[in-house]
């Protein structure tokens, strides 16, 4: 317990102190006082440095004194032989004696009193930063006007913190500017603007004078700017050393001004303003921005339009433009949206053709369609090359998005017909010589394939059977062979409207307009043994002249047998119609004059006994195309004749081309169109 005074006596005082003793006294007076220790008697064995016996005075870690020997007072009016004064409120006194004393020593007597200390003057370190005021038992610090005492009750500072600036423009200066700023202060200013605005600080060099850095480059007084995780500074020295315009990229800025005890200068003054937060001027790849600006700032909205061939995709849908807003955080909204190449997808397949697997289906990619050659060709032109267009479609320069159409090549036999072995007016033939040849089994007759869906034949062949069974692709019409050939199923039979239907067809003498079309249920697949014959053109090039040669083929009657099993063919010249008129009808069913001859009929034959006969009806009279020698067209159809082995009459197909085209057009499926 602290006391204001007290007495200390060596052991056994005033008797001699014992040997080998160590005793200590802890003196404590109240806080704010020092200790004055007075020795009134001292009689301790003397030794060098008081090594044997001694009284030691210790203050904290410091030895204030060590006494031994004998002392007497120099002042007759005072008993004090030694005194100590310390400005602290604690003191320790230690007495030690060794194992022997050569004489009898009586020790020491002392007392202490608590004395007031002047904290303002008694210490090397001044306790107050500004004014120190001593009083008995303590002191207090005080400050000049406009300063305040910090919580440590020792340091004075100016009240320069806690200001929050929210206006979009403002000015801030150090305390007392331009007079010297206060020492030993920490000033904090906060700028807090609306989100979307960045604080921009502007300083002039001449508006800044802060105590310069030490030799190590450390600022003794400093100005620091803190914006989020970015720091500008510390700055110090004569004239502002930093950038005169500081764009903080933040709506919140803390300004911290720290000063030490010395070296006050005039300080600093700055201006700040809020700039709308800028957004980067990065253009989304493959796009254009509207409006175009040199700088985009908070709340600016741009329309981003993808370039042709690019789109923004989300799930299964896409868009070519979107809006983006410069946001309060300095970033664009919708920055995830990217203009990516349009994907045209896997190209559609086409009938009788193919498209190679594309390396890419993205904008600008190119694909090529081809037809199954040599049996099909591209009818609607365009070359088959398509590119992936900006609208996501595969587009051809000629056809646009329309797909190419592979249609059968007409009139080209895989093997040309050669008359090798003479067989009474004709030769054996192979179906590859006449791939357009169609076999009708009831009645036994022929026809000509003119495209995937249509067979051309004579009207008299189908007038009695509107659901004929037809076959293609076989040279032999033996039952076993037909089973392996392609059977065609009719959908509808179209007989020319000018063909007169009779009650008794056997008595017919008028074969005018002997032409019919059979529409098939399913398309015919073309190949080496099945392909169509061309139709005649409408120009005068396709007008037949006497002597023009044509080929006939069929499984009709020969000189040896009523029906042929294998295909026969012959090459015949066109003859004047009168030649046919002059031949006597073999088995007339009426008067010879009753037989009708019209310009819709072609007369051909008369050479070497080559002629068509019963069972060949409806087959084509194939003539080489005058404009393309590789092709044959159906100039005629086997119709009737006065006598086998002489001249025969053929329906003149050229006169019916309009009817054929109209009938096919009006009865086509959407797929064919």
């Amino acid at each position: 317990e602290p006391t204001m005074y007290g007495e200390i006596l060596s052991p056994n005082y005033p008797q001699a102190y014992p040997s080998e003793v160590e005793k200590s006294w802890d003196i404590e007076v109240p806080e704010g006082y020092g200790i004055h220790l007075y020795f009134t008697h001292l009689d301790i064995e003397l030794s060098e440095n008081c090594a044997y016996d001694s009284v030691q005075i210790i203050s904290g870690d410091t030895e204030e004194g060590r006494l031994c020997g004998q002392r007497s007072s120099n002042n007759p009016h005072s008993p004090i032989v030694e005194e100590f004064q310390v400005p602290y409120n604690k003191l320790q006194v230690i007495f030690k004696s060794d194992f022997s004393n050569e004489e009898r020593f009586t020790g020491f007597a002392a007392y202490y009193v608590a004395t007031d200390i002047n904290e303002c003057t008694d210490f090397v370190d001044v306790p107050c930063s500004h004014f120190c005021n001593n009083f008995i038992g303590g002191y207090f610090c005080s400050c000049p006007p406009e300063y305040f005492l910090h919580d440590d009750m020792k340091n004075c500072g100016v009240n320069c913190s806690g200001d929050v600036f929210t206006a979009l423009i403002g000015e801030i200066a150090s305390p007392n500017y331009p007079k010297p700023y206060p020492e030993n202060s920490r000033c904090e200013y906060q700028i807090r603007l609306e989100k979307g605005f960045q604080v921009v600080v502007t300083l002039r060099r001449e508006d800044f004078d802060v105590e310069a850095a030490d030799s190590a480059g450390n600022c003794l007084d400093s100005l620091v700017f803190v914006a989020g995780d970015r720091q500008f500074g510390p700055y110090c020295g004569h004239g502002f050393p930093g950038p005169l315009n500081i764009e903080t990229k933040s709506n919140a800025l803390d300004i911290i001004f720290q000063t030490d005890l010395t070296g006050q200068k005039k300080g600093w003054k700055l201006r700040y303003h809020g700039d709308p937060m800028p957004c980067p001027k990065e253009i989304t790849a493959n796009s254009v921005w509207e409006p175009a600006k040199a700088k985009y700032v908070f709340r600016d909205v741009v329309q981003i339009t993808c370039l042709d061939g690019f789109e923004v995709v989300e799930g299964r849908v896409g868009a070519t433009s979107f809006y983006s807003t410069c946001q309060s955080n300095g970033k664009w909204s919708n920055s995830k949206l990217k203009c990516q190449p349009v994907d045209c997808g896997i190209p559609e397949s086409i009938e009788n053709g193919k498209v190679e697997d594309p390396e890419s289906t993205l904008f600008g990619s190119v694909i090529r369609y081809t037809c199954e050659e040599p049996y099909y060709y591209m009818e609607n032109g365009g070359g088959g090359e398509y590119h992936c267009a900006g609208n996501g479609s595969w587009v051809n320069e000629v056809l646009g998005p329309e797909l190419p159409k592979c249609v059968p090549v007409c009139g080209v036999p895989r093997e040309p017909f050669e008359e090798k072995q003479r067989i009474i007016g004709g030769s054996d033939a192979d179906i590859k010589n006449f791939p357009w040849q169609v076999f009708f089994d009831n009645p036994w007759a022929g026809g000509a394939l003119i495209n995937e869906y249509w067979v051309l034949t004579a009207a008299h062949v189908v007038e009695g059977n509107r659901e004929p069974t037809m076959y293609v692709g076989s040279t032999s019409v033996q039952t076993s062979r037909l089973a392996k050939s392609k059977m065609l199923t009719p959908e509808h039979v179209f007989i020319h409207p000018g063909w007169k239907l009779l009650e008794v067809p056997e008595g017919r003498t008028n074969f005018d307009n002997d032409i019919a079309l059979v529409r098939l249920k399913d398309p015919v697949k073309m190949g080496p043994t099945v392909s169509p014959i061309c139709l005649p053109g409408t120009s005068s090039d396709y007008n037949l002249m006497d002597g023009d040669l044509g080929l006939i083929s069929g499984w009709g009657r020969t000189e040896k047998r009523d029906r042929a099993v294998r295909l026969k063919a012959a090459r015949l010249p066109v003859a004047p119609l009168r030649k046919c008129k002059e031949v006597k009808v073999e088995k007339p069913t009426a008067d010879a004059e009753a037989y009708v001859f019209t310009p819709n009929m072609i007369c051909a034959g008369g050479e070497k006994g080559m002629d068509s006969c019963k069972g060949d009806s409806g087959g084509a009279f194939a003539v080489q195309d005058p404009n393309d020698k590789t092709k044959f067209y159906a100039a005629g159809l086997v119709s009737w004749g006065p006598q086998c082995g002489t001249y025969g009459l053929y329906t003149r197909v050229k006169n019916y081309v309009d009817w054929i085209m109209k009938t096919m057009q009006e009865n086509s499926t959407p797929r064919e169109d």
Epitope: R299, V301, Q303, V312, E314, G315, V317, A319, S321, F322, Y323, T325, Q327, N329, K331, S333, N334, S335, K336, L337
Partner: antibody, heavy 116, light 107 residues
Framework: QVQLVQSGAEVKKPGASVKVSCKAS????????MHWVRQAPEQGLEWMGW????????IYAQKFQGRVTITADTSTNTAYMELSSLRSEDTAVYYC?????????WGQGTLVTVSS | DIQMTQSPKSLSASVGDRVTITCRAS??????LDWYQQKPGQSPKLLIY???YRYSGVPSRFSGSGSGTDFTLTISSLQPEDFATYYC?????????FGQGTKLEIK
């Protein structure tokens, strides 16, 4: 297929906080924005804010600024919405939704009831 | 913030009717407007995006039009499953605001 599954209903006292989760499957949330929209009983839809899970950028509606925190955990493909200092008027169904061009997919909703 | 105002607030109609809902923005939102359908107890479903584009799987009887500040959602021939609440939403700039909704009821 794309799915957003939200955490279950919550009952909270005024002043408390609530954290709703939204687990995504069938897509990577880093490739989209994740939004939060709420709907008070018999009321309309109210947009609260969004997060870009790729970089944790967030934008909040001014009304919720300071009370709402939207976060995302890309490792679990989950977005979160935390609303603090709850009041009775915060009683609503909270929806998460994903977007690039539009809000094509929505969670099933989480009912948060604030009652003393 | 951009305010979105829908009209009417509610509307009664019969199956087969042609129905039009309008949405007005307090400022120009170009074509950054979407329409959503919400049935009781369900999450909203996207119908129309960018003012006039039908979202995949949405029946062709739904169509959207408009740009700037005035927009329209049209249902050409109402079906029983169309009775619901419809919301417009602008995605022109944040905050992405919704209209207050239009409740379509059976007459």
């Amino acid at each position: 297929q794309v799915q957003l599954v939200q955490s279950g209903a919550e009952v909270k006292k005024p002043g408390a906080s609530v954290k709703v989760s939204c687990k995504a499957s069938g897509f990577n949330i880093k490739e989209y924005y994740m939004h939060w929209v709420r709907q008070a009983p018999e009321q309309g839809l109210e947009w609260m804010g969004w997060i870009d899970p790729e970089n944790a950028d967030t934008i909040y509606a001014q009304k919720f600024q300071g009370r709402v925190t939207i976060t995302a955990d890309t490792s679990t493909n989950t977005a979160y919405m935390e609303l603090s200092s709850l009041r009775s008027e915060d009683t609503a169904v909270y929806y998460c939704a994903r977007s690039r061009l539009f809000f094509a997919y929505w969670g099933q909703g989480t009912l948060v009831t604030v009652s003393s | 913030d951009i305010q979105m105002t829908q009209s009417p607030k509610s509307l009664s109609a019969s199956v087969g009717d042609r129905v039009t809902i309008t949405c007005r923005a307090s400022q120009d939102v170009r074509t950054a407007l979407d329409w959503y359908q919400q049935k009781p107890g369900q999450s909203p479903k996207l119908l129309i995006y960018s003012a006039s584009y039908r979202y995949s799987g949405v029946p062709s009887r739904f169509s959207g039009s408009g740009s700037g500040t005035d927009f329209t959602l049209t249902i050409s021939s109402l079906q029983p499953e169309d009775f619901a609440t419809y919301y417009c939403q602008q995605q022109y700039t944040t905050p992405y605001t919704f209209g207050q909704g239009t409740k379509l009821e059976i007459k």
